[in-house]
């Protein structure tokens, strides 16, 4: 049976445009069961870093070590798989970086970085100095193991030099890599020394070797690609949001709910209310009122703005988000102070959310 009684049965409007919460897949880290995994929070100037897993606060335990900007998971198990986030709290703002952990029997690795530069890797040599091929940017080749979500684009690079200018060819699992070996083929950008595969599928898994050669020698470098298949998940809400707030009578306040969902989410802001002086119905369930929900006529459903508040507005506000897989909810409390007990500012307004793109 439902866990609440709605004071107003809100007829749902058509959903808002579908792309608003379509969030690009975060970086994926893959570990085999039993392995240790270390992830560095890729945020700068972090005064305080907090960690969450699937929207729930993550604290240290006998297998999870949190040191500065590093998260270590010892003896990973499939239960460690999920959506992780590190939030850097600064004096003026906060920023969150999301990443996936997938504990499978696949080889441990990180996602591929898209690299827009690369012209600097095309080195021209003095024609007199004959030279065998050599790597010009080994930093871009350090990450040999790449775990990429299915349907993403992968780029492998082997920046090289030599005189005469070397040629580059690619092997897959030690054999010549031909265009017909994969649906959609692949691109080779010789000037960037790169191999690009779009919309990867599980059959793209394997070892990719670049062979760079000229008449004076040959060098090679091998990358391992693992394609991680996704499965849909229920919405995930950023930990700590909405945040408790206080304001004076007549003030304004905003509650923010940051949503992560592949599938279209439906967002509702709900408040416990009283009916005929009672907070609970005859069935013992609390009375709830839907204050706002996502839909065509609803602007930015992730934010609930309250203006000119009264003491009656005090209480618990719930951000409830559902998609076709399941739902999630988090709540915050609003404290309304009499005017003479004003906090530091007349209006206590939280920052509006950055969309998780």
């Amino acid at each position: 049976r439902p866990s609440f009684s709605l004071v107003e049965d809100t007829t749902l409007e058509p959903e808002e445009p579908p792309t608003k919460y379509q969030i690009s897949q975060p970086e994926v880290y893959v570990a085999a069961p039993g392995e240790s995994l270390e992830v560095r929070c890729l945020l700068k100037d972090a005064a305080v870093i907090s960690w969450t897993k699937d929207g729930v606060h993550l604290g240290p335990n006998n297998r999870t070590v949190l040191i500065g900007e590093y998260l270590q998971i010892k003896g990973a198990t499939p239960r460690d798989s999920g959506l992780y986030a590190c939030t850097a709290s600064r004096t003026v703002d906060s920023e969150t970086w999301y990443f996936m952990v997938n504990v499978t029997d696949a080889i441990s690795s990180g996602d591929d970085e898209d690299d827009t530069d690369g012209a600097e890797d095309f080195v021209s040599e003095n024609s007199n100095n004959k030279r065998a091929p050599y790597w010009t940017n080994t930093e871009k080749m350090e990450k040999r193991l790449h775990a990429v979500p299915a349907a993403n684009t992968v780029k492998f690079r082997c920046p090289a030099g030599g005189n005469p200018m070397p040629t580059m060819r690619w092997l897959k699992n030690g054999k010549e890599f031909k265009q017909e070996h994969r649906i959609g083929g692949y691109k080779v950008r010789n000037q960037h020394w790169s191999l690009i595969m779009e919309s990867v599928v599980p059959s793209d898994k394997g070892n990719y070797t670049c062979v760079v050669e000229n008449e004076y020698g040959s060098i090679n470098h091998t990358y391992h690609l693992d394609v991680v298949e996704r499965s849909p998940h229920r919405p995930i809400l950023q930990a700590g949001l909405p945040a408790n707030a206080s304001t004076v009578v007549g003030g304004d306040v905003e509650f923010v709910c940051k949503v992560y969902s592949d599938a279209q989410p439906h967002i509702q802001w709900i408040k416990h209310v009283e009916k005929n002086g009672s907070k609970y119905g005859p069935d013992g369930l609390p009375y709830l009122k839907v204050l706002k929900h996502s839909g065509i006529n609803s602007s930015n459903a992730e934010v609930l703005a309250l203006f000119n508040v009264t003491e009656a507005d005090a209480g618990e506000y719930i951000c409830k988000v559902s998609n076709y897989i399941g739902q999630a909810n988090q709540s915050a409390w609003l404290t309304v102070l009499p005017k003479q007990q004003a906090p530091g500012r007349e209006k206590e307004i939280t920052a509006s959310p950055d969309y998780l793109e």
């Epitope: 959903e15 445009p17 229920r234 599938a263 439906h266 076709y324 897989i325």
Partner: antibody, heavy 114, light 107 residues
């Protein structure tokens, strides 16, 4: 492994009610929606509604609002659909499916006949 | 309600052929579309969700594409076991609606 096991075929008379079950195993039952889908040769697949077992929240297709009642029992990890005031057009195969429609029960055939 | 239209009720194919099953939504549903395969006497089997993501264990000859209102399920090289009924579905907003189905049969 993950499974949705539905109750057996039903033969009922017009005007009666019927309650069919869907027993879930192999996953956290309360954390996923449980959908019900009707299939008839004429109408194809029709979504009836869903229940979120964690808190009992339901969402119905307006077409089935007065026909179907969805419930779930967390302790037995079983979801139920009750169909009332049965008529011949309710004869169909009824499927339950987990949240992402990634796993489906084997279906329960309902025949309404006098 | 959002209407999902599969205009081709039947499609004839041969083993080894490339075939594309299409589906049109009556309004923009983003990438919130799934594809299912159903064989006689069986329950539907999930193939694709969010328009292009293949479920684990689904052969990579099945590819989903599209966004907005037009969606396609492509089988790159049809195998005998692929002869079945294929349904699209929108999981954008309730009521979640299915297409009428496309039956893939041998020429």
């Amino acid at each position: 492994q993950l499974q949705l096991q539905q109750s057996g075929a039903e033969l009922v008379k017009p005007g009666a009610s019927v309650k069919m079950s869907c027993k879930a195993s192999g996953y956290t039952f309360a954390s996923y929606n449980l959908h019900w889908v009707k299939q008839t040769p004429g109408q194809g697949l029709e979504w009836i509604g869903l229940i979120y077992p964690e808190n009992g929240d339901t969402s119905y297709n307006q077409k089935f609002k007065d026909k179907a009642t969805l419930t779930a029992d967390k302790s037995s990890t079983t979801a139920y659909i009750q169909l009332s005031s049965l008529a011949s057009e309710d004869s169909a195969v009824y499927f339950c499916a987990r949240g992402g429609f990634d796993y489906w029960g084997q279906g329960t055939t309902l025949t309404v006949s006098s | 309600d959002i209407v999902m239209t599969q205009s081709q009720k039947f499609m004839s194919t041969s083993v080894g052929d490339r075939v594309s099953v299409t589906c049109k939504a009556s309004q923009n549903v983003g990438t919130n579309v799934a594809w299912y395969q159903q064989k006689p006497g069986q329950s539907p089997k999930a193939l694709i969700y969010s328009a292009s993501y293949r479920y684990s264990g689904v052969p990579d000859r099945f590819t989903g594409s599209g966004s907005g209102t037009d969606y396609t399920l492509t089988i790159s090289s049809v195998q005998a076991e692929d002869l079945a009924l294929y349904y699209c579905q929108q999981h954008y907003s309730t009521p979640y609606t299915f297409g009428g189905g496309t039956k893939l049969e041998l020429k």
